[in-house]
Amino acid sequence: AITEAREEAKPYPLFPGPLPGSLQTDHTSLLSLPHTSGYQPALMFSPTQPGRPYTGNVAIPRVTSAGSKLLPPLAFKHTVGHIILSEHKDVKFNCSISVPNIYQDTTISWWKDGKELLGAHHAITQFYPDDEVTAIIASFSITSVQRSDNGSYICKMKINNEEIVSDPIYIEVQGLPHFTKQPESMNVTRNTAFNLTCQAVGPPEPVNIFWVQNSSRVNEQPEKSPSVLTVPGLTEMAVFSCEAHNDKGLTVSKGVQINIKAIPSPPTEVSIHNSTAHSILISWVPGFDGYSPFRNCSVQVKEVDPLSNGSVMIFNTSASPHMYQIKQLQALANYSIGVSCMNEIGWSAVSPWILASTTEGAPSVAPLNVTVFLNESRDNVDIRWMKPLTKRQAGELVGYRISHVWQSAGISKELLEEVGQNNSRAQISVQVHNATCTVRIAAVTKGGVGPFSDPVKIFIPAHGWVDHAPSSTPAPGNADPVLII
């Protein structure tokens, strides 16, 4: 047998429960235990009793299933209903109930505003048992109360599937006004009306609002919170705040700056990232936006050439990214480039102009009068042409590229030759006999390869055939010449 001295003389702490603010409901607690899984309730209660209104916090028993024994009704004792205290003070409150020991299965928990308080840091339940009754005192303490602790607190005792609910204890934490809405910084159009809003709450109520502009009160008479200040218009930047007053004192909102929208500052640091013969990639650093978002930018391009007419090309682009590729430019040309950006108020001045140059272009025309003939004795094909009339922008001629394609019995092979700029003729070795050779020539500058000439074809016979008649670039409209020997 196990023996030990009785402990009934001292109080027993119970479920140190709930931490304020931890409001999730634990649906698995006994407080919502279903009549399933074989856990039949040991005690049953009816919700009403003849001749007595049901008060909501009293468990009224009936005859139990075990037979004839009646269980007495239970109710929490009345306690203080409303506690008013200042922020940061400590508070402790409790509910108490005397439970006959025949109630052999109970749990007790704290609830706030309809949600169970979970956790274990601020509640303690103590028992004072004797032979017939156990006095239960459930205490809840909050150190340094905050506004979030405001609310209605109740104790719930669960006896099987019946609940006994205490009267609510309403905690009201009073303090300086607390802003729920403060004025916001704004960017406004000059001389245009706008509104600012300020809202603060207690308790204690009421809360009165004063508006302050650049350290001076705007309204002599306070307005009840919430307050909307209509400012008819400003010509220069101003700082606004609001003061919220209640019986505990005053709280001042943050100061907010109201800016006047203006045209943007010009962009800075226009930079060249990449130049080709016909395009220039630029970037820039936006200037100050004038308190209004950029809408778009304009890239202005002037050709720097005494002979040009000085006209300005304008390219519109989005404000972001701060980069633009200027296209359709002349090769080997100098340009002056500036950037301007706009917001809802207007265009900025143009950025400082920068100089940029395009690179050489490729030739725009092909070599002229291409002729091809067979020099059988040397087993060569002779090719002759005339230098194309290239523009200055194409740059200095550095040579020619010759393409010759050999076609025979379904086989095709292309070869490329490079010759210097001083040549106007070339010889290529015969690659295949009994085949057609197709020749095209392009001029080459540092800017690239120009267009190829129209193809000229010559038939290369089997060994032993002789012919020196040339093939030449056809006159416009004629079919490709093919010399058959």
């Epitope: 196990i2 023996t3 030990e4 009785r6 402990e7 009934e8 027993y12 702490p13 119970l14 479920f15 140190p16 429960g17 634990d26 698995t28 607690s29 006994l30 235990l33 899984s37 856990y39 039949q40 309730p41 040991a42 005690l43 139990t64 299933s65 075990a66 037979g67 024994k69 269980l71 439970v99 020991n101 025949i102 109630y103 052999q104 299965d105 109970t106 749990t107 007790i108 928990s109 979970l118 956790g119 274990a120 339940t125 028992f127 048992p129 032979d131 017939e132 156990t134 239960i136 005792m157």
Partner: antibody, heavy 120, light 107 residues
Framework: QVQLVQSGSELKKPGASVKVSCKAS????????MNWVRQAPGQGLEWMGW????????TYAQGFTGRFVFSLDTSVSTAYLQISSLKAEDTAVYYC?????????????WGQGTLVTVSS | DIQMTQSPSSLSASVGDRVTITCKAS??????VAWYQQKPGKAPKRLIY???NRHTGVPSRFSGSGSGTEFTLTISNLQPEDFATYYC?????????FGGGTKVEIK
Amino acid sequence: QVQLVQSGSELKKPGASVKVSCKASGYTFTNHGMNWVRQAPGQGLEWMGWINTYTGEPTYAQGFTGRFVFSLDTSVSTAYLQISSLKAEDTAVYYCARKGVTAARYFDYWGQGTLVTVSS
Amino acid sequence: DIQMTQSPSSLSASVGDRVTITCKASQNVRTAVAWYQQKPGKAPKRLIYLASNRHTGVPSRFSGSGSGTEFTLTISNLQPEDFATYYCLQHWNYPLTFGGGTKVEIK
């Protein structure tokens, strides 16, 4: 002082019944519920359920319905556990354990245990 | 059902050591956890109730802590008579459930 004294060991054949008693003294019997806990050889503790000693209402854990019956004789402050249709797997030590104070469900006093052996 | 996961399942320690046993509940059980000590062939003996309260007569070297889902039994300055098996019990929700036990053996 509080005491819970259980009946002695039992050796039973499969299919038979056994009734284990738990006699309480040193407190008001009807003020504290009585739990039953099983411990198979070399195993841990398993809660079987409890009986309200005032109303006689039993509550059974799953797995302990049907063949297991909790009962009381309040005149002699005794709780009983009866197991019928015994099986080999019912071989275990059975403990009665008193519920603690009102509003709590832990056990504050235990009987010394009764070994029930089921063997053919 | 609420599961109580007890760890470690066994441990070896010497007299004078500090021993910590933990129990994790599968759901929030507030502070409704008790701890019991059992020696071979004997009934369990109560140690701690409501997570942190020592029963009368239990030496002060036994202490309990925790709330919600994590609970700890600590034995500081282990004594020869403390070598036994320890069980936690959650008593917030039915069915009441025990941890699997921790056997404390002599190193």
